[in-house]
């Protein structure tokens, strides 16, 4: 009982991971004008993995997207592309873990083949996590020197007369998401991973068998040093983590100078 | 298409109130903030601030922060300016504009301060 | 606050002629979020309110005649009429809608000589 509420604990755990982590990649803000040196900006930047917002005064959103592959940063590339593969991996680790689930029986799978799938996508969920993770991190990373780097030369001059702000970037909500997301993913491959070792068999039972030695009738039971044989109550200590966030995404999208009705 | 239609000319004495509706129609009202200005006879244009109807968000002029009130009425699409303790240099056409640069204006309300 | 100051104060020019209308800007008005300038160019003529002509200093809002551009960048910008029309005689306005308090030039009285 205790193995399938770890699994499917796992299983719901990653779920709402996975889908922080599709949520985070495709959310348009993961930086976001700093506006501490210009607290009263009309025009508020915003930058995702994908695309460039601005809202300007009127309450109007205009995003851009970025349509070159080439001219992007590397990093932002790398970035891409470990939240993908995170995606893929969750996405593949819950088709597998779906038909591992112990509550579900499909035709003759057997107790072995069960605790392997369900090894396979906690494996899968906790590469799914860490990518999520590592691509969050190496972006805010890229954040954080960028806003030093513009912070050493911030005021540019402009013909000696007038200063201008360079606008800088701080965190976004899609890092926090992603943060969390990407731990939620980990922490449900890891109760995963607990909860195949609870569904894998643990000894071979043999049946019984007499060895006559000559002169005495004593009965051998070999394998007899395992307390529990898989088939009585489980009495080992396992734990379940529990891993519950909420994270939520509040962006309002705009509609253009001719979605007037 | 977009029309944005504003309350009838008001008189008020000195330390009086004034509240301006502005009923928008023929878009999204909560997509779009809407902006308060106002002209003084034969005088240029000054920004009041603007409202938010979509979250009630606001930002006012300093000049204007202690007497202006601005509010919303999703319902009815109409958003409202109040100008408290009135003086006589309060005496303008006040504008409600919204849409991309300001696009769609009010035809103005005229409001004399006068003893 | 960004003040914004317009020249001249009024302008004569002949039908057919091109005016120009100067906007200078206390602190520059570009946005480099996406390379865009954020001023706004109104066209008011008495009893009305004012019209729109040009957003982000270059851009003209639609229905306005192409006679009407708008240039400039940073903290220097200039409305041009081309070729002035007898019913381009009105006040035009240039707007800070990079910071708040969004803030108007004076205003420039255009008519014709």
């Known amino acids: 009982m205790a193995v399938t509420a770890c699994q499917g604990l796992g299983f719901v755990v990653s779920l709402i991971g996975i889908a922080g982590i599709i949520a985070a990649t495709c959310m348009d803000q993961w930086s976001t004008q700093d506006l501490y040196n210009n607290p009263v900006t009309a025009v508020f930047n915003y930058q995702g993995l994908w695309r460039s917002c601005v809202r300007e005064s009127s309450g109007f959103t205009e995003c851009r997207g970025y349509f070159t592959l080439l001219g992007l940063p590397a990093m932002l590339q790398a970035v891409r592309a470990l939240m993908i593969v995170g995606i893929v991996l969750g996405a593949i680790g819950l088709l597998v873990s779906i038909f591992a689930l112990k509550c579900i029986r499909i035709g003759s799978m057997e107790d072995s083949a069960k605790a392997n799938m369900t090894l396979t996508s906690g494996i899968m969920f906790i590469v799914s996590g860490l990518c999520a993770i590592a691509g969050v991190s190496v972006f805010a990373n890229m954040l954080v020197t960028n806003f030093w780097m513009s912070t050493a030369n911030m005021y540019t001059g402009m013909g000696g007369m007038v200063q201008t702000v360079q606008t800088r970037y701080t965190f976004g909500a899609a890092l926090f998401v992603g943060w969390v997301a990407g731990g939620l993913t980990l922490i449900g491959g890891v109760m995963m991973c607990i909860a195949c070792r609870g569904l894998a068999p643990e000894e071979t039972n043999y049946k019984a068998v007499s060895y006559h030695a000559s002169g005495h009738s004593v009965a051998y039971k070999p394998g007899g040093f395992k307390a529990s044989t898989g088939f009585g109550s489980n009495t080992k200590n396992k734990k379940i983590y529990d891993g519950g966030a909420r994270t939520e995404d509040e962006v309002q999208s705009y509609p253009s100078k001719h979605d007037y009705v | 298409q977009v029309q944005l239609v504003q309350s009838g000319a008001e008189v008020k004495k000195p330390g009086a109130s004034v509240k301006v509706s502005c009923k928008a129609s023929?878009?999204?009202?909560?997509?779009?903030?809407i902006h308060w200005v106002k002209q003084a006879p034969g005088q240029g244009l000054e920004w009041i601030g603007y409202?938010?109807?979509?979250?009630?968000?606001?930002n006012y002029n300093l000049k204007f922060k202690d007497r202006a009130t601005m509010t919303s009425d999703t319902s009815i699409s109409t958003a409202y300016m109040e100008l408290s303790r009135l003086r006589s240099d309060d005496t303008a056409v006040y504008f409600c504009?919204?849409?991309?640069?300001?696009?769609?204006w009010g035809q103005g309300t005229l409001v004399t301060v006068s003893s | 606050d960004i003040v914004m100051t317009q020249s001249p104060d009024s302008l004569a020019v002949s039908l057919g002629e091109r005016a120009t209308i100067n906007c200078k800007s206390s602190?520059?008005?570009?946005?480099?979020?996406?390379?865009?300038?954020?001023l706004i160019w109104y066209q008011q003529k008495p009893g009305q309110p004012p019209k729109l002509l040009i957003y982000?200093?270059?851009t003209r809002d639609s229905g306005v005649p192409d006679r009407f551009s708008g240039s400039g960048s940073g903290t220097d910008f200039t409305l041009t009429i081309s070729s002035l029309q007898a019913e381009d005689v009105a006040v035009y306005y240039c707007?800070?809608?990079?910071?708040?308090?969004?803030?108007f030039g004076g205003g420039t009285k255009l008519e014709i000589k």
């Open positions: 023929g878009f999204t009202f909560t997509s779009y903030n």
């Open positions: 409202i938010s109807p979509g979250n009630g968000g606001s």
């Open positions: 504009a919204t849409g991309r640069g300001f696009a769609y």
């Open positions: 707007q800070n809608d990079y910071s708040y308090p969004l803030t």
């Open positions: 602190q520059s008005l570009f946005n480099s979020g996406n390379q865009k300038n954020y």
């Open positions: 982000r200093a270059s």
